[in-house]
């Protein structure tokens, strides 16, 4: 049982007996884990003649031979003479074909073929018997070899334990010789004393040749299950790990390939390598430059790290991430890049390794290979990038990667598109440079197209919608992005995603995107025409009923449905309706759906962000006289007055605005009292002149963005399990706290209010939100 490790010998172990080694590899008689061979193979031909496709007769050659052979003319006498010669030598020809070794030297036998390259019929018929004869000879030789080796092993074992180091060296050389033949190799591995002696000699010797031969012997034994077990039982693993410190390349190469075979096929080997300190040694070897050696070493690291957190941390402590990233940056050998990307993939799900890989430039290094012809390499790089992407939102120099990811959205490979969308979603989170870059390279169009192509494949639509949500808020190109979604025919499909069969995480993301799209006045009518408003109200009612039902049943804990809290849906839908309500026609539709009682009820919510969006939508609706009256009729004055004293300035300001708009038809003294009340409550902490307040708008922040992938080793990350849905209610650690300044394209000044002295200034000067006010749809998480 051999592995791809065989291939290492030719390239790496500088042996005197290279011919033997080459013939050994040419036989390809080993189990190949696929690292090095990777070759397209055909089934062996039963006739022993190789690939049947290559057996087509070349007719031009036949014709040529025909002309060549028979263009000369013979007399009858010559023909008879030749016939006679053939008849006389028939027996010899048969004997020559079947038993060539029985012929006398120098004996000439006339051939029946003019062209020596073609076998005669007799020779063809003799082929099976020759093959049988060779098989018998090989069997006899095998038995002889086995017998001789069995006889020699006790003596060789003794010699390996000799005091004289020269004798030990000679013994090591001879054992290595024997290990190259299959029969004697089996004899060696069946002797525990011999294998133990080899292991002991290998780790105790100071002689380069002895170390090379003993390591080479173990390498040869490691091609067989029996050999692997013998090495394992003889304590070979700690010895081989020790040899990883050898300054001699051939010893090093033998040691790593043998360990690789053990890790692949021997139970218990992984733990033994870890205990022997193999991980640290292997990481230290990553600065070597032989690509095939590095491919084996990185594959060993992958085997050891997969599913083992402690190993991942040891690799981190040994400087593994930096070394692995360097390999991805430096080399072009596909197998090495593939094995290295596999290690990085395994490490990328470890919360400690993740930032280390990112800081080492892992995102950029992995991005270099996204256009490689090797699909397995591209896929590994994408999986790894997706796992890392939530930790890479602050990285610089991502332009190239972002451009490539946008290109990959057009791929026909569904896995590629899924990963590209997921990575873009995370990289556009809280990073205005990345947002702008993606917009500039046609990201909006590509994402809209991706959503259109994806149909109901939520593993694609959800991250794509999240990416669009991020791109449509809080950066200089946001307004362009909001328009671009419409111009590329995205609005119908976006609204469609609010409907079944969409699940809650996708609905939540879509609601947030619609909220951002509504920031663009040109989208108001198309969104209304696509039926966004009734569906948002329907979702709001359903989610609110769900929260109420749980509250009435005595539940205090917010419950998740498909990883989404229903409170998030309430907040998101209300927030979207709030922005849509800037349009007079939309306000009519919203009011017509009997939403005011629900919005007033939401003012009583214990969640500040829900209070804020509810007050916000009421503020917009209250612009219309009938709506203001309806709000008052629903008993909103009491909760709104209460909210004036909220510690959340956004809530208090919206409440004040609604109360003010509701007072429009009230007597002058009522208005004056309200004005005083508003002034004292809103500016209780730092009174300032109304006209000194900045124009900060009513919107606090912009639509939410996610945290990323969280599970352990499996490469595929569901967006529903601890990933894209973790952006609610200001809970996430990566929230952007940028609320103190104006965000182009996101905020708007309130207009359309009557000139009422100080109160008008109040409307123009809504205070900035504090970090607690980050509604889930107003953050990039």
């Amino acid at each position: 049982m051999a592995t791809q490790a065989d291939l290492m010998e030719l390239d790496m172990a500088m042996e005197p007996d290279r011919k033997a080694a080459v013939s050994h590899w040419q036989q390809q008689s080993y189990l190949d884990s696929g690292i090095h061979s990777g070759a397209t193979t055909t089934a062996p031909s039963l006739s022993g003649k190789g690939n049947p496709e290559e057996e087509d007769v070349d007719t031009s050659q036949v014709l040529y031979e025909w002309e060549q052979g028979f263009s000369q003319s013979f007399t009858q006498e010559q023909v008879a003479d030749i016939d006679g010669q053939y008849a006389m030598t028939r027996a010899q020809r048969v004997r020559a074909a079947m038993f060539p070794e029985t012929l006398d030297e120098g004996m000439q036998i006339p051939s029946t073929q003019f062209d020596a390259a073609h076998p005669t019929n007799v020779q063809r018929l003799a082929e099976p018997s020759q093959m049988l004869k060779h098989a018998v000879v090989n069997l006899i030789n095998y038995q002889d070899d086995a017998e001789l080796a069995t006889r020699a092993i006790p003596e060789l074992t003794k010699l390996l334990n000799d005091e004289d180091q020269v004798v030990v060296n000679k013994a090591a050389v001879m054992v290595h010789q024997l290990s190259k033949k299959e029969a004697s190799r089996h004899a060696i591995m069946r002797s525990p004393q011999m294998v133990s002696a080899i292991v002991r000699t290998m780790q105790n010797t100071n002689d380069v040749e002895t170390a090379r031969c003993t390591a080479g012997t173990l390498h040869n034994l490691s091609h067989h299950r029996e050999g692997l077990l013998a090495i394992f039982k003889s304590g070979g693993i700690p010895a081989l790990v020790k040899m990883l410190g050898s300054p001699v390349d051939s010893v090093l190469f033998y040691a790593i390939t043998t360990l690789h075979n053990l890790l692949l096929h021997q139970e218990g080997a992984k733990m033994a390598v870890r205990l022997a300190g193999g991980l640290q040694k292997m990481v230290a070897l990553l600065n070597k430059t032989n690509v095939k050696f590095l491919a084996i070493t990185t594959d060993c690291l992958q085997i050891l790290a997969y599913g083992n957190q402690e190993s991942k941390l040891i690799i981190l402590a040994s400087g593994g991430p930096q070394a692995l990233v360097n390999i991805m940056r430096t080399y072009t050998y596909e197998k090495l890049l593939w094995t290295t990307s596999r290690v990085l993939k395994v490490l990328s799900v470890c919360s400690s390794n993740k930032p280390a890989i990112v800081e080492a430039g892992g995102m950029q290094a992995l991005g270099l290979h996204l256009t490689d012809p090797s699909q397995r390499l591209v896929q590994n790089c994408l999986w790894t990038l997706r796992n890392l992407s939530d930790a890479a939102t602050k990285q610089e120099g991502m332009e190239g990667l972002l451009g490539t990811l946008v290109q990959l959205l057009g791929s026909d490979d569904i896995n590629v598109v899924t990963c590209a969308a997921g990575i873009l979603s995370n990289l556009t989170c809280n990073n205005y440079k990345n947002k702008m870059m993606v917009c500039q390279v046609g990201g909006i169009e590509a994402l809209v197209r991706t959503v259109l192509r994806a149909g109901d494949r939520e593993d694609i639509t959800e991250p794509a919608i999240c990416a669009l949500r991020h791109l449509t808020s809080r950066h200089q190109e946001a307004e362009m992005a909001q328009n671009a979604v419409r111009l590329h025919y995205g609005l119908p499909v976006v609204v469609k995603l609010l409907h079944p069969p969409s699940h809650w995480p996708l609905i939540k993301a879509t609601v947030g995107l619609i909220r951002n799209l509504a920031l663009c006045p040109a989208n108001h009518a198309p969104l209304r025409e696509q039926g966004a408003i009734p569906r948002l109200v329907q979702l709001l009612v359903r989610a609110h009923q769900d929260t109420q039902r749980r509250t009435s049943m005595g539940g205090t804990q917010q419950q998740f449905v498909e990883g989404v809290r229903m409170e998030e849906i309430v907040e998101g839908c209300t927030g979207a309706l709030h922005i849509l309500a800037r349009d007079v026609h939309n306000r009519i539709v919203i009011r017509g759906l009997n939403t005011i009682p629900l919005f007033v009820q939401l003012l009583y919510s214990p969640i500040e962000n829900i209070q804020r969006v509810a007050a916000g939508v009421l503020c917009e609706l209250a612009q219309d006289k009938e709506a203001a009256e309806a709000i008052e009729a629903e008993g909103a004055t009491a909760p709104l007055t209460e909210l004036l004293h909220s510690r959340n300035e956004g809530v208090a300001t919206y409440a004040a605005a609604v109360l003010f708009r509701m007072s429009e038809d009230k007597p002058q003294d009522y208005k004056k009292r309200l004005s005083v009340e508003l002034t004292s409550s809103l500016f209780r902490t730092e009174p300032m002149a109304w006209n000194e307040t900045a124009d900060l708008g009513l919107d606090i922040g912009a639509q939410g963005e996610p945290l990323g992938y969280r599970q352990d080793d499996p490469s595929y990350r569901s967006f529903h399990s601890g990933g894209y849905g973790q952006d609610a209610l200001g809970m996430d650690p990566m929230m952007e706290h940028e609320m103190g300044g104006h965000h182009p394209g996101a905020d708007y000044p309130v207009d359309g209010l009557p000139d009422l002295g100080h109160a008008q200034d109040l409307m123009d000067g809504l205070p900035p939100g504090d970090s607690n006010q980050l509604a889930w749809f107003d953050t990039d998480l």
Partner: nanobody, 123 residues
Framework: QVQLVESGGGLVQAGGSLRLSCAAS????????LGWFRQAPGKEREFVSV????????YYADSLKGRFTISRDNAKSTVYLQMNSLKPEDTALYYC????????????????WGQGTQVTVSS
């Protein structure tokens, strides 16, 4: 019946060279180890060199300091001993011996012996 016949001995001046041969018969030559011993007048027989049946591995007595080289030709069933930079103290009767051992170095490990060939080195 195993037979070993040595040849190539003779008289040579100090610093000169000789090549001894030992032809074997009646034995599966390629599966045996062959050695050379020598016996100086009035002294015990001493080990000179051995060549193993495994990969032609060789071993020499420490005293030879790289002056002698043992080799074998399995096709001719013959073992050779190339002696260079000969010294008067190399004068001895040189014996060829055969063994089934892996790397035999003592007399007892060899089963069959030749009659020997005389080497005399004059000063």
């Amino acid at each position: 019946q195993v037979q070993l016949v040595e040849s190539g001995g003779g008289l040579v001046q100090a610093g000169g060279s000789l090549r001894l041969s030992c032809a074997a018969s009646g034995v599966s030559f390629s599966r045996t180890s062959l050695g050379w011993f020598r016996q100086a007048p009035g002294k015990e027989r001493e080990f000179v060199s051995v060549i193993s049946w495994i990969g032609g591995t060789t071993y020499y007595a420490d005293s030879l300091k790289g002056r002698f080289t043992i080799s074998r030709d399995n096709a001719k069933s013959t073992v050779y001993l190339q002696m260079n930079s000969l010294k008067p103290e190399d004068t001895a009767l040189y014996y060829c011996a055969i063994s089934n051992g892996v790397l035999p170095r003592t007399e007892g490990a060899f089963a069959s012996w030749g009659q020997g060939t005389q080497v005399t080195v004059s000063s």
